[in-house]
């Protein structure tokens, strides 16, 4: 997260760290007791490493009573996701067992009504992604409150040049933005999961390259079918 602040510890009990060989790779969001939603491209970066999910964490390194690392029983990328595009960039990870819920571990309600979030709405994005252009990684969870940007502006030739589909949404990126390592993390608007950080190699913090998020409401049928 660029230009953000350290999050209040455990105030985002849905927040997950998707890890490979014990290292943070991507963000994720607990959407059901045994399921974490993330970005499909995160798996590509995992290669053949052991994928696990850390829940209940604020610090990645320090011991915390609520922290627990879960093995992944099944990884289900969206069937239409492709390495060369950010379309359908969603991934569902089934934990090896149901998460132990508590104040620091709790699923987040996700949006099922397939309607765009109003531009100007302030939404929270959080993650353990890089906090500087130099690539500095934080130990503790960071967050930033960003306004949603209308799709027409996001699709301008000077911005994302028509790449933003109806199944995506954008948020402002003027010095404050999600970045590398935040992919798969949640964009939360008024207590409801609306978007998942896409995992392209987009430049971060540039006003003309807004953050791109996959709209979860557009994938309600797929999410429901996997979770069923």
């Amino acid at each position: 997260i660029l230009g953000g602040r350290e999050a209040e510890a455990h105030a985002r009990p849905y927040m997950a760290s998707v890890q490979v060989n014990g290292e943070h790779l991507c963000g994720g969001v607990l959407v059901a007791e045994q399921w974490v939603l993330s970005a499909a491209h995160c798996l590509e970066d995992a290669a053949d490493g052991k994928v696990q999910v850390l829940l209940g964490a604020h610090s990645l390194s320090q011991p915390e009573p609520s922290k627990r690392l879960y093995d992944v029983l099944r990884a289900v990328p969206h069937p239409d996701s492709r390495p060369d595009t950010i379309d359908h960039d969603l991934l569902l990870l089934q934990l090896s067992e149901k998460a132990t819920l508590g104040p620091a571990v709790r699923p987040l309600p996700w949006q099922r009504v397939d309607r765009d979030v109003e531009p100007g709405t302030l939404c929270d994005v959080a993650g353990w992604g890089i906090v500087s252009h130099a690539g500095r990684r934080p130990d503790r969870l960071q967050h930033v409150l960003l306004p949603v940007l209308d799709r027409a502006t996001c699709n301008r030739r000077t911005h994302h040049d028509g790449a933003i589909t109806q199944r995506m949404m954008c948020a402002e990126s003027n010095r404050r933005d999600s970045c590398k390592g935040d992919s798969g993390g949640p964009l939360v608007c008024g207590g409801v999961l609306e978007g998942v950080v896409t995992s392209g190699s987009r430049v971060c913090g540039n006003r003309k390259k807004p953050g791109i998020y996959t709209r979860v409401a557009s994938y309600a049928a797929w999410i429901d079918s996997v979770l069923a």
Epitope: R5, A11, G120, L122, V188, G190, G191
Partner: antibody
Framework: QVHLQQSGPELVKPGASVKISCKAS????????INWVKQRPGQGLEWIGW????????YYNEKFKGKATLTVDKSSSTAYMLLSSLTSEDSAVYFC???????????????WGQGTSVTVSS | DIQMTQSPASLSVSVGETVTITCRAS??????LAWYQQKQGKSPQLLVY???NLADGVPSRFSGSGSGTQYSLKINSLQSEDFGSYYC?????????FGGGSKLEIK
């Protein structure tokens, strides 16, 4: 403690412009959105728009686009609202208010300025 | 825009009574609602955020409830300092519109 101090009352002529200020203290100015709200005499509250001092990002209620322009001066922790082409309909008390954040993504206007009265009269 | 319909517009009550003010949103606002109190000639003050949470320093006789499109503010055992106008405001999308207000007067 948090305090938002607004500039004094204004009496302006129709067609003119007026710039009112809101000086923030007691918190990190660049970290919080500042809103502006209009209240006509004896009436309810209308949201005009917000500005984020950390990036100068703004968002306006469609109704106030072209009427209000929001700016900030980070060096003095002051937010400004310029109201242009004034008519009697713009006679009102204008408040600045800070967005406070709660939990992961809830917010509300937690601190308000005392209000600035703008009277448009020839 | 989401419309916020507040009722009653005015009410006259005695000290010690309990009052309830309601606010109806034109669509689901997912508990993204605040309540404010405004005294004559003063700025509004935040009472409740996220539909049910009391802001710092607000007496416990105030309580917020509701979900979806229906919300209410309850004031138990009304005190003389509670008289004034009350407004709800949603934060689900833009613009974050206010209700028309409820004026609470002493009987």
């Amino acid at each position: 403690q948090v305090h938002l101090q607004q500039s004094g009352p204004e009496l302006v002529k129709p067609g003119a412009s007026v710039k009112i200020s809101c000086k923030a203290s007691g918190y990190t100015f660049i970290d919080y959105y500042i809103n502006w709200v209009k209240q006509r005499p004896g009436q309810g509250l209308e949201w005009i728009g917000w500005i984020f001092p950390g990036s100068d990002s703004t968002y306006y209620n469609e109704k106030f686009k072209g009427k209000a322009t929001l700016t900030v001066d980070k060096s003095s922790s002051t937010a400004y609202m310029l109201l242009s082409s004034l008519t009697s309909e713009d006679s009102a008390v204008y408040f600045c208010a800070r967005y406070g954040y709660y939990g992961s993504s809830f917010y509300a206007m937690d601190y308000w300025g005392q209000g600035t009265s703008v009277t448009v009269s020839s | 825009d989401i419309q916020m319909t507040q009722s009653p517009a005015s009410l006259s009550v005695s000290v010690g009574e309990t009052v309830t003010i309601t606010c109806r949103a034109s669509e689901n606002i997912y508990s993204n609602l605040a309540w404010y109190q405004q005294k004559q000639g003063k700025s509004p003050q935040l009472l409740v955020y996220a539909a049910t949470n009391l802001a710092d320093g607000v007496p416990s006789r105030f309580s917020g409830s509701g979900s979806g499109t229906q919300y209410s503010l309850k004031i138990n055992s009304l005190q003389s300092e509670d008289f004034g106008s009350y407004y709800c405001q949603h934060f689900w999308g833009t613009p974050p519109t206010f209700g028309g207000g409820s004026k609470l007067e002493i009987k």
